[in-house]
């Protein structure tokens, strides 16, 4: 998490014009995880590497966007590039490239995440939702999701909307939300941890 957009950008920018064209065509037919839509063909084919990077991140978020990019690169026979991309973005899949901060480990952890355990209390008691959104924006929340949460009229409905996106999150994404909660309402987290 955190640098997937950078890793995707480097991978796509290091494709030749012909390879980028091939990448886009493969992206139109690559199998997608359930619940994810496809980038419209018309928009996709006209994009440069930078636009495509941002579109991948906004459509699929950073973690899945990087995984999908690596899958397509592998399918194109670019195993080394796919491997480098995954090394830079996937938790526990080897060291990050020299000089790059390795992402936090996200091995399977026993039981429910704090965020899921205390869902009802967080919906009822979080007041600083805007702060959370800013902390999560571009990392685990797409622009659309960010706007959708902000559009809700009350804090509980904002939190309810935010929780509607968490089923697609991995443990690391939930850790980011927990970290943001610790920074904005530490007393609430401490209270819930004691309960």
């Amino acid at each position: 998490m955190g640098r997937a957009r950078d890793a995707i950008l480097d991978a796509l920018e290091n494709l030749t014009a012909e390879e980028l064209k091939k990448f886009k065509l493969k992206l139109l037919s690559v199998p997608l995880r359930e619940g994810y839509g496809r980038i419209p063909r018309g928009a996709l084919l006209s994009m440069d590497a930078l636009d495509l990077t941002d579109k991948l991140v906004s459509f699929y978020l950073e973690t899945y966007g990087a995984e999908l990019t690596a899958n397509v690169l592998r399918d194109m026979g670019l195993q080394e590039m796919a491997g480098q991309l995954q090394a830079a973005t996937h938790q526990g899949s080897g060291a990050a490239p020299a000089g790059i901060q390795a992402p936090p480990q996200s091995a399977a952890k026993p039981g429910l995440h704090f965020i899921d355990q205390h869902r009802a209390a967080l919906i009822a008691r979080v007041t600083n939702v805007e702060w959370l959104l800013d902390a999560l924006y571009g990392k685990v929340l797409t622009d659309e999701q960010y706007q959708a949460v902000r559009a809700e009229p009350t804090n509980p409905s904002k939190m309810r909307k935010l929780f509607s996106f968490t089923p697609a999150w991995n443990w690391t994404c939930k850790d980011l939300l927990l970290q943001a909660l610790r920074e904005s309402q530490s007393y609430l987290v401490e209270d819930l941890e004691r309960s």
């Epitope: 957009r5 480097d10 920018e13 494709l15 014009a17 000089g99 790059i100 571009g138």
Partner: antibody, heavy 117, light 107 residues
Framework: QVQLQQSGAELARPGASVKLSCKAS????????ISWVKQRTGQGLEWIGQ????????YYNEKFKDKATLTADKSSSTVYMELRSLTSEDSAVYFC??????????WGQGTTLTVSS | DIQMNQSPSSLSASLGDTITINCHAS??????LSWYQQKPGNIPKVLIY???NLQTGVPTRFSGSGSGTGFTLTISRLQPEDIATYYC?????????FGGGTKLEIK
């Protein structure tokens, strides 16, 4: 460890051209972009352009489009920047920097260019 | 091109203080903003990437926040080694562009 070794200081005449080099080591050369950044004495940082090493894709700041040309030699893991039609305005320190996506994590030591008649 | 406006251009503070430097982008850059520190006579060094992520090895006294068009670098418990010029840089669109810099001095 990651290193970007830049060529030594240059003294050039107005109207001439110079070619600065930046040799990379300690990382997979073709996985990144290398940028060049200009800094005049006592001034801020100005991004000149960037070259992606595997594809040779280049991007330039419009201001430097007619001034600078970026090239890469994969066999020697070296990036070059040629500056042409030199004037006193081109006297500056030029840095090469490895970009990981949209931010740079390693910089060369800088090359001082002095343009003087 | 995206313009990056940094303020203040210079700043004088006492050891132990907390200071903030602001950076405003001329258009939405999401969270694609980095902060650099350049000490006198030295090369620039990245402190923060993606608006709020601390680069490996950078002290936790440094923190970044913001998204969209407004960003802030905060340095808490100011130390003598923090004397430097600080630059923001956007990474949303080519050409990458830097702010004009903020020169930090100790009172």
């Amino acid at each position: 460890q990651v290193q970007l070794q830049q060529s030594g200081a240059e003294l050039a005449r107005p109207g001439a051209s110079v070619k600065l080099s930046c040799k990379a080591s300690g990382f997979s050369f073709t996985s990144y972009g290398i940028s060049w950044v200009k800094q005049r004495t006592g001034q801020g940082l100005e991004w000149i352009g960037q070259i992606y090493l595997r594809s040779s894709n280049t991007y330039y700041n419009e201001k430097f489009k007619d001034k600078a040309t970026l090239t890469a030699d994969k066999s020697s893991s070296t990036v070059y920047m040629e500056l042409r039609s030199l004037t006193s305005e081109d006297s500056a320190v030029y840095f090469c920097a490895r970009y990981y996506g949209s931010s740079s994590d390693y910089w060369g030591q800088g090359t001082t260019l002095t343009v003087s008649s | 091109d995206i313009q990056m406006n940094q303020s203040p251009s210079s700043l004088s503070a006492s050891l132990g203080d907390t200071i903030t430097i602001n950076c405003h982008a001329s258009q939405n850059i999401n969270v694609w903003l980095s902060w650099y520190q350049q000490k006198p006579g030295n090369i620039p060094k990245v402190l923060i990437y993606q608006a709020s992520n601390l680069q490996t090895g950078v002290p936790t006294r440094f923190s970044g926040s913001g998204s969209g068009t407004g960003f802030t670098l905060t340095i808490s418990r100011l130390q003598p080694e923090d004397i430097a010029t600080y630059y923001c840089q956007q990474g949303q669109r080519y050409p990458w562009t830097f702010g004009g810099g903020t020169k930090l001095e100790i009172k």
